[in-house]
């Protein structure tokens, strides 16, 4: 048992033209986090297996906001090590996959959005208990600098953490430079003495007298870097820097083959021989498989149909991207018409319509009065996205549902007496006055002050009742016509209204879920 430790030193734009200025999208600030995946590296099925040695996720780094006109700096990184505990023996050779993820902190409906910025995969040889190994890797336009090591956790010791030692109550029984080791309490062993001069930093040994080199170093004493990538000094746990033997220029200069691929020169070009599970001209297609859980947000991982794609992700509603890492901003397409408010609920889209509109996308232009008929023969008056009821006589309130006393306002002038009637009110005028509201004086010569009034029509005339009856019949006919019109309108819009009410109910339920 033991722990693999990874220290990220820097992540930023690589050298050369076309380097990105910022890891953030135009939506605003973001922060970085890292994911590490370890696989045993020598077994035939290594590329198809999951992160069998373990995986870890870093904390989120500090928020990064791009400064206008400022040079792109190394980006703020999460604090601390990434630690991957392993339970069994340390395999020595392994695949190291490091992913850099971006978390966007702009106004994302439903939370932050993630996207994969860079992924590097390297096959490495590393003995447990050895010094920090340092590396620099390019992934597209990005450059990642990091160190790593594997260390055993007591009682495990050795380059594979397979030997068990435990402290003794009487350690003096072992001579100087010797250590007690299980299974026998009195058994002492010497740690292997490496070949004289073997690099303490880049070499190690499992048997006395040998000198085995860490990845990137060669020579009898592990002093010779195998490529220029080892020449780069890093701000790492070890501050020592090394000299370099820079090979002459050539197609394989710097080893263009990623993921542990070996480079061989061809006339004017190069050819990469990729390890099992890696593909592409430069072995750049990752060997991550479905068992590694590469699909974010619960996405379904399916093995790729062709050799160049290790997997594909079938994303849950509301997510997209090759790893389901991007939250779909479906509202940016402005699907809600007529000024409707768009709500992306993750698994579904909802439009909250303005008054007077309905339908899944607010596409139906409703009459303001539709479905909101005024009761008791009142007429609906439209205006400015609202509605108002003009009530029939005898009724009042917002929807004409309240019975009103038509005589309460004393409508009969000149002392006329008011009588409530189903069609409104009737005024019995005092002597000397006439008219619907007793508003016209009657002159002594029998002619009213109203020139257009028919001669001979007086308050006491028997004809008056007939005229009132005619007026009543006309009013009832008009009211009946309005009611029929309103009912037909209600029927026509009922289905839209019903759909809109259902939509609102669903939206309320889902927003509160």
């Amino acid at each position: 048992a033991g722990v693999f430790e990874l220290q990220i030193h820097s992540f930023g734009p690589g050298p050369g033209p076309g380097a990105p200025r910022s890891p953030c999208s135009a939506r605003g600030p973001c922060r970085l986090f890292f994911r590490v995946c370890l696989k045993p590296g020598l077994s035939e099925e290594a590329a198809e297996s999951p992160c069998a040695l373990g995986a870890a996720l870093s904390a989120r780094g500090p928020v990064y906001t791009e400064q206008p006109e400022a040079p792109a700096p190394d980006l703020p990184l999460p604090n601390g090590l990434l630690q991957v505990p392993f339970r069994d023996a340390w395999p020595g050779t392994f695949s190291l996959i490091i992913e850099t993820w971006r978390e966007e902190l702009g106004d994302q409906i439903g939370g932050p959005a993630w996207s994969l910025l860079a992924r590097v995969t390297r096959r490495r040889r590393l003995a447990a208990g050895g010094p920090w190994a340092r590396d620099i890797q390019r992934a597209g336009a990005w450059e990642l600098r990091f160190s790593y090591r594997a260390r055993c956790e007591l009682p495990a010791v050795g380059t594979a953490c397979t030997r068990l030692c435990r402290p003794r109550s009487a350690p003096s029984r072992c001579g100087p430079g010797l250590r007690p080791c299980a299974p026998l309490e009195d058994e002492c062993e010497a740690p292997p003495v490496c070949r004289a001069g073997c690099s303490l930093e880049h070499g190690f040994c499992e048997q006395p007298g040998e000198c085995r080199c860490l990845e990137g170093w060669t020579g009898p004493l592990c002093m010779v870097p195998v490529s220029t990538s080892s020449c780069l000094g890093l701000r790492g746990p070890s501050s020592t820097t090394t000299g370099c033997l820079v090979p002459g220029p050539g197609p394989c200069d710097g080893n263009p083959c990623a993921n542990g691929g070996s480079c061989s020169e061809t006339p004017g070009s190069f050819e990469c021989t990729c390890p099992r599970g890696f593909y592409g001209l430069r072995c750049e297609v990752s060997g991550v498989t479905c068992a590694d859980g590469p699909c974010f947000n619960g996405g379904l991982c399916v093995g790729g149909a062709d050799p160049d794609s290790a997997y594909i992700c079938h994303c849950p509603p509301g997510f997209q991207g090759s790893n389901c890492e991007k939250r779909v901003d479906r509202c940016s397409l402005q699907p809600c018409r007529n000024g409707g408010l768009c709500l992306d609920l993750g698994h579904a889209l909802r439009c909250r319509c303005r008054a007077g509109f309905a339908g899944p996308r607010c596409e139906h232009d409703l009459d303001d009065c539709a479905g909101r008929a005024c009761a008791n023969g009142g007429t609906c008056v439209e205006g400015g996205g609202a509605h108002r009821c003009s009530c029939a006589l005898g009724f009042g309130g917002r929807n004409c549902r309240e019975r009103a006393d038509p005589c309460a306002a004393r409508p009969c002038a000149h002392g006329g007496r008011c009588y409530a009637h189903f069609s409104g009110l009737v005024c019995a005028c005092a002597p000397g006055y006439m008219g619907a509201r007793c508003e016209f004086p009657v002159h002594p010569d029998g002619v009213s002050a109203l020139p257009a009034a028919p001669p001979g029509l007086r308050p006491g005339d028997p004809q008056r009742a007939g005229v009132i009856a005619v007026i009543v019949v006309v009013v009832i006919a008009i009211v009946a016509g309005i009611v029929v019109l309103v009912i037909s309108r209600k029927k026509r819009m009922a289905k839209y209204e019903k759909a809109e009410i259902k939509e609102m109910g669903e939206m309320h339920r889902e927003l509160n879920a």
Epitope: F33, C37, P50, C51, A55, A56, L57, A291, D292, G293, P294, C295, N297, G298, G299, L300, C301, H314, P316, P317, G346, H347, A348, E510, A513
Partner: antibody, heavy 117, light 107 residues
């Protein structure tokens, strides 16, 4: 090969408690959403609840029928997800399966929970 | 919650015959429907996702179709090992829900 193995089922009285475990192998467990789905005898499938990842602050979601009584947790270092069931009712009698992801791609063999007096 | 209704409840067929199973959703679920197979004493197994995509390792005789509210699982020529209960599940709206199942039995 991916394997999910549930355990912890058994006979319990109404009002009692039980804790189910599901151990995963063959996958990078810490990267998978985990669900519990149950199946009452002779009946269909019912989703019980879900736990997401460390990067999601281990967010949990539950079916209305178990909300407030059941709790899902996970221990990534042990490749294990748990279902703590309290205040059990006779209608909780079922085979309980653990499954992965949003789409329930991998399933365990199930463990039987019987709630009876 | 979205309700899924499967029909028929039981389908009696002989090996080699074509099986057509139906699943209707109470509201639009797009193509977010999966089909699962469950044999007696076993756990369910994902067959089809996204209404029409075969999951890894599923034989070509299984196919799915439909969108919106009406979905179909077709087994072109029944093999002896295909006699089981089949469930549809919707993944459009949280929480996910399942149909009541269709039992495909030997005639």
């Amino acid at each position: 090969e991916v394997q999910l193995v549930e355990s912890g089922g058994g006979l319990v009285k109404p009002g009692g408690s039980l804790r189910l475990s599901c151990v995963a192998s063959g996958i990078t467990f810490s990267n998978f959403w985990m669900n519990w789905v149950r199946q009452a005898p002779g009946k269909g499938l019912e989703w019980v609840g879900q736990i997401r990842l460390k990067s999601d602050d281990y967010a949990t979601h539950y079916a209305e029928s178990v909300k407030g009584r059941f709790t899902i947790s996970r221990e990534d270092s042990k490749n294990t997800v748990y279902l703590q069931m309290n205040s059990l009712k006779t209608e909780d009698t079922a085979v309980y399966y653990c499954t992965t992801g949003y789409y329930f791609d991998y399933w365990g063999q199930g463990t039987t929970v019987t709630v009876s007096s | 919650n979205i309700v899924l209704t499967q029909s028929p409840a039981t389908l009696s067929l002989s090996p080699g015959e074509r099986a057509t199973l139906s699943c209707k959703a109470s509201e639009n679920v797009g193509t977010y429907v999966s089909w699962f197979q469950q044999k007696p004493g076993q756990s369910p197994r994902l067959l089809i996702y996204g209404a029409s995509n075969r999951y890894t390792g599923i034989p070509a005789r299984f196919s799915g179709s439909g969108s919106g509210t009406d979905f179909t699982l077709t087994i072109s020529s029944l093999e002896p090992e295909d006699f089981a209960v089949y469930y549809c599940g919707q993944f459009y709206s949280f929480p996910s829900t399942f149909g009541g199942g269709t039992k495909v039995e030997i005639k």
